[in-house]
């Protein structure tokens, strides 16, 4: 029976993934019972991605390593809608690393997943970025401008946001 074998395969996948993410929250996508999209619990989901707010304070490199161990990366923000979703889960008195850095200090910003950096889809606070030695980007809240990006020193510990594609089983 097709449905039975599909369910057995799905359960097997869920068991296999438990070693990385002990619990997954899955939803049926569309009309087809075959397609389940999952995010680890308690990650949040938006469109085809899952997001995790890491409250541990670490350097940018360690934050990225922490995300990659989970099969994710520091967040790459592609649209205003995506940023609007992300900020719903952030605390105003905290700053969070993004997956955006300028390793050479030459204002050649690059996303960790090689998504091309598009100047037209950036949300820097006014006057930012403003320091060639500050080579990593955070998102934070400023009362005058709400949420936006700022460049900071990469070694200064911050909270962070991880992003991964939804897991399809």
């Amino acid at each position: 029976n097709f449905m039975y074998s599909k369910t057995v395969k799905r359960l097997s996948k869920l068991r296999e993934y438990q070693q990385y993410h002990p619990s997954l929250t899955c939803v049926m996508e569309g009309k087809d019972i075959e397609d389940w999209s999952c995010c680890p619990t308690p990650w949040t989901s938006f469109q085809s991605s899952c997001y995790f707010i890491s409250t541990g304070m670490q350097s940018w490199t360690k934050s990225q390593k922490n995300c990659s161990v989970m099969g994710a990366d520091l967040v790459v923000i592609n649209t205003r809608e995506e940023q609007d979703f992300i900020i719903q889960n952030l605390k105003r008195n905290s700053s969070y690393f993004l997956g955006l850095s300028d390793p050479g200090g030459r204002r050649h910003w690059q996303w960790v997943d090689q998504t091309p950096y598009n100047e037209n889809v950036t949300f820097w606070h006014s006057g930012e970025p403003n320091n060639l030695d500050e080579r990593c980007a955070i998102i934070n809240f400023r009362s005058s401008e709400e949420w936006g990006w700022n460049d900071i020193h990469c070694h200064v510990p911050q909270k962070s946001i991880c992003k991964m594609k939804k897991i399809y089983i």
């Epitope: 070693q19 990659s68 099969g71 399809y168």
Partner: nanobody, 127 residues
């Protein structure tokens, strides 16, 4: 944790071939995309090749495509890098790396995206 151990390096004559191996232990190998990087003396570590969890998808650095092949044997928990027509510019320490991946992508070209690394194997090409 994933442990990675490279082997197959050594001294090779220019024009020769070499197959590097990387044996993985620890977690379920089939859930990890694998990559090869290399680092020549005084240079930054550079991307060589990557392969998806199933082995169906591969991605190689443009400049190396013609001579390098990446493959994996999930039954043996091993990933391979076959190098042909070696030249002195290929002299480097070759590292293998693993990245947890829940899809079948091989587009992982940045060192930052790999959580686990081997110690490396030295390849020296003499002219």
């Amino acid at each position: 944790q994933v442990q990675l151990q490279e082997s197959g390096g050594g001294l090779v004559q220019a024009g020769g071939s070499r197959r590097l191996s990387c044996a993985a232990s620890g977690r379920t190998f089939i859930n990890y995309a694998m990559g090869w990087f290399r680092q020549a003396p005084g240079k930054e570590r550079e991307f060589v090749a990557a392969i998806s969890t199933s082995g169906s998808n591969t991605y190689l650095a443009d400049s190396l495509k013609a001579r390098f092949t990446i493959s994996r044997d999930n039954a043996k928990n091993t990933v391979y890098l076959q190098i042909r027509s070696l030249n002195p510019e290929d002299t480097a320490v070759y590292y293998c790396a693993a990245r947890l991946s829940f899809d079948d992508s091989a587009y992982y070209t940045s060192t930052l995206r790999y959580a686990y690394w081997g110690q490396g194997t030295q390849v020296t090409v003499s002219s």
